[in-house]
């Protein structure tokens, strides 16, 4: 259940945390899973355990394998597994997919790229940053604490970013590199007066008495993230929650679905076991944002079930 993938490059430092948590005071025992051999805690060893951390200083390809950690709490022991893979250094600039950390997205307003796993290491500023293997230079790039800030982000800033830092352990220095992709989101968003795509104004919806019926209120509000936008249903001008009919409930459909770049919202009105009196109600689909409110009204009409006898008359 508690298995975590970790990877690194040969001759670099790699530090792995036990996937099971515990307090700093709890003993954590580490084992090499294949042999059940205990991993030493003495720091003179190249691979050693230090509480919740397993340290490879430096890592070797032969270290690859599954490591077991057991957290000894006052109640029950808890076991985790660290699946470690150490790769040979690439001769060319390409960083293969298996060495990449999660992709991050940025925009004009927010362009921070965090250096992955750095919190596990004893490092000192500054971090070195590279894009597609080229050292980043120029005033647009600022290495700040454990992240890189890019000013005035442009589409061309997308790419693979590598952070490089030095881990210090008892006076010895070890290099660490980590790479992640950065994508740029177009944030040229705008907001419009709500446009209701469904239902049509004054639509008549045919329903069968005793069956369930669904009405979808769907509206779009502009492009990009919207500050305030909502769709809802009203019955005879009253909020669904205040109307007090448990058979009639609304639930959010697809939230902020960016089809064609548009920010749209759906709200589904579910009517269980349709009754005659439901046909007398006025159903209003409301869409509102900072520009204002738009309303489309729907009425229900009885769908006459096909009279199978008459077909053969």
């Amino acid at each position: 259940k508690f298995s975590k993938q970790s990877w690194g490059l040969e001759n670099e430092a790699l530090i792995v945390r036990c996937p099971r948590q515990g307090k700093p005071s709890y003993t954590v025992d580490w084992y090499y899973s294949q042999t059940n051999k205990s991993i030493p805690t003495q720091e003179r060893n190249r691979v050693f355990a230090s509480g919740q951390l397993l340290k490879f200083l430096p890592a070797a390809v032969a270290d690859s394998g599954i490591y077991t950690c057991i957290v000894r709490s006052p109640t029950f022991n808890r076991t985790g597994y660290a699946n470690v893979t150490i790769y040979k250094k690439q001769s060319d600039c390409n960083v293969p997919d298996y060495l990449m950390y999660s992709t991050v997205s940025g925009s004009e307003k927010n362009s921070k790229i965090y250096c992955p796993t750095i919190d596990l290491y004893n490092w000192t500023a500054p971090l070195e940053w590279f894009k597609n293997c080229q050292a980043l230079q120029g005033s647009r790039y600022r290495a700040h604490k454990s992240f890189l800030v890019i000013d005035n982000v442009m589409t061309e800033d997308a790419g693979d970013y590598t952070c490089k830092f030095i881990h210090n352990e008892n006076g010895a220095n070890y290099s660490v590199t980590a790479t992640r992709s950065f994508t740029v989101k177009d944030e040229q968003g705008f907001s419009l007066f709500p446009v209701i795509g469904a239902p049509a104004q004054n639509e008549i919806k045919e329903v069968e008495i005793g069956k369930n019926a669904n009405l979808t209120c769907s509206a779009c509000f502009g492009k990009g993230t919207q500050f305030l936008a909502a769709v809802l249903w009203q019955l005879n001008g009253t909020k669904i929650t205040d109307f007090g009919e448990p058979r009639i409930q609304q639930e959010e459909g697809q939230n902020q679905s960016f089809s064609n770049g548009l920010a749209c919202l759906d709200m589904v009105l579910r009517i269980a076991d349709v009754k005659e009196e439901d046909l007398l109600l006025q159903y209003d689909c409301l869409a509102l944002n900072l520009h204002g409110l738009r309303r489309h009204t729907v009425r229900l009409s009885r769908k006459n079930p096909i009279d199978h006898h008459s077909i053969y008359c």
């Epitope: 259940k1 099971r20 948590q21 515990g22 307090k23 057991i70 709490s73 006052p74 109640t75 029950f76 022991n77 808890r78 076991t79």
Partner: antibody
Framework: EVQLVQSGAEVKKPGESLKISCKGS????????IGWVRQMPGKGLEWMGI????????RFSPSFQGQVTISADKSITTAYLQWSSLKASDTAMYYC??????????????WGQGTTVTVSS | DIQMTQSPSSLSASVGDRVTITCQAS??????LNWYQQKPGKAPKLLIY???NLETGVPSRFSGSGSGTDFTFTISSLQPEDIATYYC?????????FGGGTKVEIK
Amino acid sequence: EVQLVQSGAEVKKPGESLKISCKGSGYSFTNYWIGWVRQMPGKGLEWMGIIYPGNSDTRFSPSFQGQVTISADKSITTAYLQWSSLKASDTAMYYCARHGTSSDYYGLDVWGQGTTVTVSS
Amino acid sequence: DIQMTQSPSSLSASVGDRVTITCQASQDISNYLNWYQQKPGKAPKLLIYDASNLETGVPSRFSGSGSGTDFTFTISSLQPEDIATYYCQQDDNFPLTFGGGTKVEIK
């Protein structure tokens, strides 16, 4: 299928003794802690204690220490909760629950169906 | 003993509503907290272990978070079958202790 099956409901008089059981199946009984949880009528859950059938190691809540005995017979994969002298306040539903192995634990992941104990004169 | 304080003790919500229950431990328990669901007349059932991990087979509308002393349990969209009492339980120290429970009802 992993399951814990408890003995049936009991009606007793104050001062009488009682032993209820919990039979484990579908897993390695000796490798998992088994515990007991009390639920008085209309109230919440109270943890009583546990036993490790592999070596009969036990742990008790101070509230139940000395009030009950927890034991296990690994040959028939059954854990027991017993009272030597019942009181009216022992009237409750008693659940047994599996508590993880000696090396790993994920909460009380398997529960018995419960045994109702009624103590009344 | 570690005291577990659960709130609210009961709540009423509509189908589809987001429901949140909190549990506070009297001391740091790391992430050693579990959540259980008990339906009327039934045995409790484990939903979440280690504060945030969903037990196998439990619907994804249930989630948990928190560490240290403050924990939260959430039902993202309440369903009729979620009518039950929910309990938190710490297992950082013996004796294991449960919160007082939160009874969830449908409006």
